[in-house]
Amino acid sequence: SGLNDIFEAQKIEWHEVPRWRQQWSGPGTTKRFPETVLARCVKYTEIHPEMRHVDCQSVWDAFKGAFISKHPCNITEEDYQPLMKLGTQTVPCNKILLWSRIKDLAHQFTQVQRDMFTLEDTLLGYLADDLTWCGEFNTSKINYQSCPDWRKDCSNNPVSVFWKTVSRRFAEAACDVVHVMLNGSRSKIFDKNSTFGSVEVHNLQPEKVQTLEAWVIHGGREDSRDLCQDPTIKELESIISKRNIQFSCKNIYRPDKFLQCVKNPEDSSCTSEI
């Protein structure tokens, strides 16, 4: 009923941008974007007691205010400030799990290990996960046809700036031991150009964060290499050490068993290396 009230109150009509308007290289706004964001907000605030007082209508107003009527290649972090503020969330700062190029496993892990949090376990990350959105300069329309691609069009687009902003704040809030899950199957296990490598690494606060612990997830069944010795991991260690944060690394040789052992830590087979 909360959602119905919100839509009845404003009777928003979201028109598609006509096809003859500027075509971007990326996919357009996710269909039913306003409804999806509001529905997710209502669901999240119902489930998470610490966010129950959040007004989802205000959250949506702040979200749309960040990109509606603005050129989709000229979005700034400042545009998202009201949304970031309304989505302020106190997560246990020593229970943060960052990830790079291995989102699904990270999310499977926090679904089992309920006291740890990825960005997508917070309100703002949950609202935007897997969605695309953009508007158009000087019109109140949402562009459902196409949105700027980060590489082919511009980096300061609504989606990229959102994730950069929210990732920075998430990293800034971390403390003690921070974990990061990295994909050992990729040519660059640590990629300086990923959100983790370009934003989160540089916004961990050395006065609060003692250690960054990397979990390198192996892909092949028979892969017994020590991927913690990979040159890109050494590069990550160097960046972190220069920031006066300690670094440690663990190989997760069998991610399936790893998840199983998180679910059932008493299992006798879980004492050996995973």
Epitope: S58, D61, P82, M84, T88, Q89, R169, K208
Partner: antibody, heavy 123, light 110 residues
């Protein structure tokens, strides 16, 4: 110089309404959150409502203020308002408007305050 | 509801004394350190002293310092001056951008 000036306080009967104003000067009004905070006589501070208007109004309230209190803004007059309805004796307080520090590293703190306006709810 | 508890509620001190005020929050503040301290004198609005637990606001003398994280914070005046006799409030910032203030600590002349 940053200045915030509240007005509109006074004596009102229980169940009555009052509209407070907060006139701002000396800064770019649209770029800051303005927060209403109150202080009952001899008591501590309590936040009431917040508003920010970069394009449209974005506002939110303390749980206890939802439904009775409404915050709004007139950008042409550089003024924020607090409409208070169904007033009770326990709403008697000095009402301050304050400007929040700007920038994500500083949000959540109040760097500039008005002098306050006293609201007395009594029959 | 979030509770911020300050202790003591009143504190008597002499000029030159070292004074410490404690603030405890019923929930962890945002970012583990999103807590401010204000000074208020009778009939005046509060004045920001410290933000993010340990950062001195502009123009505040260095005899003021803050520390703590999570739920426990302290404000210290290393050597109380005549101008410091006032009431001090802590203020936390929490999920959903909500704010809470402590009940205040009055620092009076012994």
């Amino acid at each position: 110089e940053v200045q915030l000036l509240e007005s509109g306080g006074g004596l009102v009967q229980p169940g009555g309404s009052l509209r407070l104003s907060c006139a701002a000067s000396g800064f770019s009004f649209n770029n800051y959150w303005i927060i209403w905070i109150r202080q009952a006589p001899g008591k501590g501070l309590e936040w009431v409502a917040a508003i920010y208007s970069p394009s449209g109004d974005i506002k939110y309230y303390a749980d206890w203020a939802k439904g009775r209190f409404t915050v709004s803004k007139d950008n042409s007059k550089n003024t924020v308002y607090l409409q208070m309805n169904s007033l009770r004796a326990e709403d008697t307080a000095v009402y301050y408007c304050a400007r929040e520090l700007s920038g994500s590293s500083y949000e959540g703190y109040f760097e500039s305050w008005g002098q306050g306006t006293l609201v007395t709810v009594s029959s | 509801d979030i509770q911020l508890t300050q202790s003591p509620s009143t504190l008597s001190a002499s000029v030159g004394d070292r004074v410490t005020i404690t603030c405890r929050s019923s929930q962890s503040v945002y970012g583990h350190n999103w807590l401010a301290w204000y000074q208020q004198k009778p009939g005046k609005a509060p004045k920001l002293l410290m933000y993010r637990a340990s950062n001195l606001a502009s123009g505040v003398p260095s005899r003021f310092s803050g520390s703590g994280s999570g739920t426990e914070f302290t404000l210290t005046i290393s050597s109380v001056q005549p101008d410091d006799f006032a009431t001090y409030y802590c203020q936390g910032y929490y999920s959903g951008a909500s704010y809470a203030f402590g009940g205040g600590t009055k620092v009076e002349i012994k």
